[in-house]
Interface confidence: low
Amino acid sequence: YKAEVTVSQVYSGSLRVLNRHFSQDLGRRESIAFRSESAKAQKMLQELVASTRLGTYYNSSSVYSFGEGPLTCFFWFILDIPEYQRLTLSPEVVRELLVDELLSNSSTLASYKTEYEVDPEGLVILEASVNDIVVLNSTLGCYRYSYVNPGQVLPLKGPDQQTTSCLWHLQGPEDLMIKVRLEWTRVDCRDRVAMYDAAGPLEKRLITSVYGCSRQEPVMEVLASGSVMAVVWKKGMHSYYDPFLLSVKSVAFQDCQVNLTLEGRLDTQGFLRTPYYPSYYSPSTHCSWHLTVPSLDYGLALWFDAYALRRQKYNRLCTQGQWMIQNRRLCGFRTLQPYAERIPMVASDGVTINFTSQISLTGPGVQVYYSLYNQSDPCPGEFLCSVNGLCVPACDGIKDCPNGLDERNCVCRAMFQCQEDSTCISLPRVCDRQPDCLNGSDEEQCQEGVPCGTFTFQCEDRSCVKKPNPECDGQSDCRDGSDEQHCDCGLQGLSSRIVGGTVSSEGEWPWQASLQIRGRHICGGALIADRWVITAAHCFQEDSMASPKLWTVFLGKMRQNSRWPGEVSFKVSRLFLHPYHEEDSHDYDVALLQLDHPVVYSATVRPVCLPARSHFFEPGQHCWITGWGAQREGGPVSNTLQKVDVQLVPQDLCSEAYRYQVSPRMLCAGYRKGKKDACQGDSGGPLVCREPSGRWFLAGLVSWGLGCGRPNFFGVYTRVTRVINWIQQVLTHHHHHH
C-alpha cells in the first residue's frame, strides 16, 4: 500500500454577491460587521467548492476582504490535489467548475444559494502560493481597503507605527485602471514596497517591488492592468516616521495605436510613449505604432534612453517589454547606456512597431524618440556602431564601440591624415598657418566650413570648422563667431605660480571648489558657470550624502583650517547626478551642483573653460590636478590646496593596466613610475590642461584608481568631452531655476 502523494494548490480570487451591498464597516477588518460577514461568506465559499468535484480536495479557505459595488468578496482557498492531477486543475479549469455549479439548478439547493446570489460572470480565480498567503496574513493587522472614484486623487493613510507590514487594497470602476503614486520623503530607509496586479500580494502578479528609499526614482507612478491593485509595505528598521507618501487615482485606458508620417529631414521628429509616460507601463500594455517614411533613401532610427533592445529566443519571455519590429522579435532591457535601434527601409509602406508587456512585472514607462537617417551614409564623418546603433567618433584613440571596430583599420589614429600621401601629423599642427603636409593640405579650408568629423568643431549654426580646439583662442573661426562666445573662463587670477611646487598660491586655480559636509572637506569640484559646480557622482553614493541640503561649497579657498577674505561659500539648491552613473564600474562619474545664488567672479573665484565634444586633449600633454586630498595613500586630507602635474595617457595603455575596465567616458593621467597622482579627498576635483591661448580647459574629474601614485596604475578621470552634451543639457534646462 502506498499513500497517494498530494500537493497543496492555492487559489486566490474574488466573487460578486448581487443581493448584498458594501458598507464602510465591511472595509474595516476589526469591525463586528466584517467579522460576522466574512464568517458567513467563508462558509458560502466552502459550500460552493464542496458542491463540485473539488470538494474532496478542499483543505481550507478565507475571505479576507470586501469591496464596493454589489458586494465583492476577496478570498483564497487551498486544495490538496493528487500530484498527477496538479496540472489539470489550472485556475481556468477551477473557475469553470465553480461557474458550472453556480449556473446549475441542482435540486439539492445548496444552502449558500439561499443567502447569497453569486454572479457567475464576476468570478475571478488566480493562481497563488502558500507564501502569498503568508505575506497576506502578515498584513492583516494593517489592511486598508479603498474604493477610488473616477477623477479623485485619493491620498492613502500611512502605515500604523506599531505594525511591520501593511496592505492597501485598491479598487476602482471596472472600465478604468488603477494608478498609484509613491513618493519617497527621505533619501535613506530600508522599507520595502511591492505593488501587485491583483487584490492580494500574489507573487505571480507582482508589478514592481522597491527596496529602500529609491534615490533613482524619488517619485514613481505605477499602473495596474485594470481596476484592482494591492500595495504591500514592509517596515525597514528605524522608520520612526513614514518614509513615503502614497496616493491613488482611477484613470481611463489610453490608446497607443498611432499612424505617423515622417518628413524628409534628419533631426528628431517626435517620440513614441507608453500610456501615461513616465508612469510605469501597465501589465496590459499593447502599443502599435505605424511610421511611414517619405522615401527609401531613409532608414528609421529609434533613440532610447537607458533602455536597449536585443534578440531573445522565442521560447523565452521578455521580462522588460517585447518589441516586434518588421517581424523581428526583440526584448527590451534597462541599461545605463544610450541605445538606438536602426530600421533599414525595404518597403515604401513604412514600418509597424509593436510593444507588449508579456508579464505582470513592468518597469518605468518607455519613451522613444524617432528620426530618419540617410541609409547610404548613416553617420556622416563618424562610425556607425552596430552594437548599439550609435554614431561614434572614429580613429580618435578611444574605443567607443563595445566591439572596438571604430578604432580598427585606422591610417591615422588621433592624428590628421594628409591627403597627398596619407602621412599623419599631430592635430595641433592643423590650421596653424604652418604647412606640414607635402602639398600643405593641413592648411587648406581653414577659413571655410568643412564636412563635420571627429575632430572638427561644430559651430552654433551647425557648420563645422577644420581647425582643432578653436574655442576661446582669440580668433573667430566660425562664421557666426560662436567659437569665441562664453569665453569668460579659464584664466588664472593673481597667479604667482610656484613652478614644480606642490602648494598652490591664491588665485592660481580660481575654479577649484571644496565640497563640505558639516565643516568637513569631502570632495573637490570645479566652477563652470556662475551657478554651477561640477564634481564626481561617486561623492554622493552614500545614502547619507545624497541630499543637496547637506552640502556647502567653498570657492576661492586655500586652507581647510582657516578662512581668508578671498573665499566664498554657497549652499546647494539642486544636485544632478548623471543618469547613467554606475557605482561599480565608475562609468559616467559626473554630477552638477546648482548653487543657491550666483557667484560674483573675482581674481580668486572664476570658472574653468568647458571643452567642446570635439576638443582633443593629446596623450602625452602635461596637465594639472588640484585638491586637498591625501598626500599619501591612506593619509589624512591636506590643509593647503595642492597641485601636481600629470601626463595624459593613451587610452589603450591605461585600459591594459586596468584590465579593460576603462570606459570611453574615462581618461587616464599620471606616470608609469607612479608618484604623482590624485588621492582620497581629491575626488570630483579638476584635471585641467592649458591651451596655447593661455586658457585652461577642464579635461577630467578625479574619479578612481588603484591606490594613489602606485607604479603602473594611472589615475582615472571622468572624460569631460564624453559627458559634455549632458552637462550642456542640464545647464540649459535649469538655467533659470532658483
Epitope: T164, D188, R190, G236, M237, H238, Y240, R518
Partner: antibody
Framework: QVQLQQPGAELAKPGASVKMSCKAS????????ITWVKQRPGQDLEWIGN????????YYNEKFKSKATLTVDTSSRTAYMQLSSLTSADSAVYYC???????????WGQGTSVTVSS | DIKMTQSPSSMYASLGERVTITCKAS??????LSWFQQKPGKSPKTLIY???RLVDGVPSRVSGSGSGQDYSLTISSLEYEDVGIYFC?????????FGAGTKLELK
C-alpha cells in the same frame, strides 16, 4: 575616535531598579541609534532594544519590554537604560553600542556588570 | 523572530589552519549580517558587516561570505590572537538576533 564609557559594575537588591549610563564621544550622537545588549555569564548575546537620540524613538525586544526603559540626554551625550523589578536572572553584563543600519554595531562599550543579590 | 543557527558550537584548530564558522538564518536576511569576536572578560569586537565587508583594522586573513540564509566566516590561516568566541548577528529585521556563538580554541 569613537568611545563609549560605561560604569564597570552595579550592585542591586532583588525587586529594586538600576539605571546604568553610556556616555558617547567621537561621533555625532544624535545621528546614530544606541543599542543595548545583554550577556549572562558564559551565555550568548541578547538584544534588548534601540533608542534614537535624535528623536527619542525606541524599539524593544518583546522579551524586555516590561523590564527595560531606554532614555537619552542629548546635552550630555549620554544614553541610559533602567532595569526594574530585578531578579537574579538580570545578573549579567550589559553593553551599549552605537548602531547603524548598514554597519550594525562597529564599536562597543566596555559593558556594565550588574549583580542582583540580597 | 529570525532564528540564527550557528555551527559548530566549539572547535579546536592548529596555528596556520583554515577555519570556517557558519550561521544559518531562518529566512532571507539580505546580507544584513555581522560577525563579532569576543575574548573572556572583554566586550565584543566587530570583524565583518554586511556579510562580507571587513571592518577597518581587521586583518585580511578574516573574510565573510554568503547570501540569503547561509553565511560563513573564514580565517585563512589561524593565528594565536584569533582564539575566542565568535558570534553572528542578523540585523535585517527587529528584533536583532545573535547566533549562540562558536568557541575557537587552539589544538
Amino acid at each position: 575616535q569613537v568611545q563609549l564609557q560605561q560604569p564597570g559594575a552595579e550592585l542591586a537588591k532583588p525587586g529594586a531598579s538600576v539605571k546604568m549610563s553610556c556616555k558617547a564621544s567621537g561621533y555625532t550622537f544624535t545621528s546614530y541609534w544606541i543599542t543595548w545588549v545583554k550577556q549572562r555569564p558564559g551565555q550568548d548575546l541578547e538584544w534588548i532594544g534601540n533608542i534614537y537620540p535624535g528623536s527619542g524613538s525606541t524599539y524593544y525586544n518583546e522579551k524586555f519590554k516590561s523590564k527595560a526603559t531606554l532614555t537619552v540626554d542629548t546635552s550630555s551625550r549620554t544614553a541610559y537604560m533602567q532595569l526594574s523589578s530585578l531578579t537574579s536572572a538580570d545578573s549579567a553584563v550589559y553593553y551599549c553600542a552605537p548602531y547603524d543600519s548598514d554597519y550594525a554595531m562597529d564599536y562597543w562599550g566596555q559593558g556594565t556588570s550588574v549583580t542582583v543579590s540580597s | 523572530d529570525i532564528k540564527m543557527t550557528q555551527s559548530p558550537s566549539s572547535m579546536y584548530a592548529s596555528l596556520g589552519e583554515r577555519v570556517t564558522i557558519t550561521c544559518k538564518a531562518s529566512q532571507d536576511i539580505n546580507n544584513y549580517l555581522s560577525w563579532f569576536q569576543q575574548k573572556p572578560g572583554k566586550s565584543p569586537k566587530t570583524l565583518i558587516y554586511r556579510a562580507n565587508r571587513l571592518v577597518d583594522g581587521v586583518p585580511s586573513r578574516v573574510s565573510g561570505s554568503g547570501s540569503g540564509q547561509d553565511y560563513s566566516l573564514t580565517i585563512s590561516s589561524l593565528e594565536y590572537e584569533d582564539v575566542g568566541i565568535y558570534f553572528c548577528l542578523q540585523y535585517d529585521e527587529f528584533p536583532l538576533t545573535f547566533g549562540a556563538g562558536t568557541k575557537l580554541e587552539l589544538k
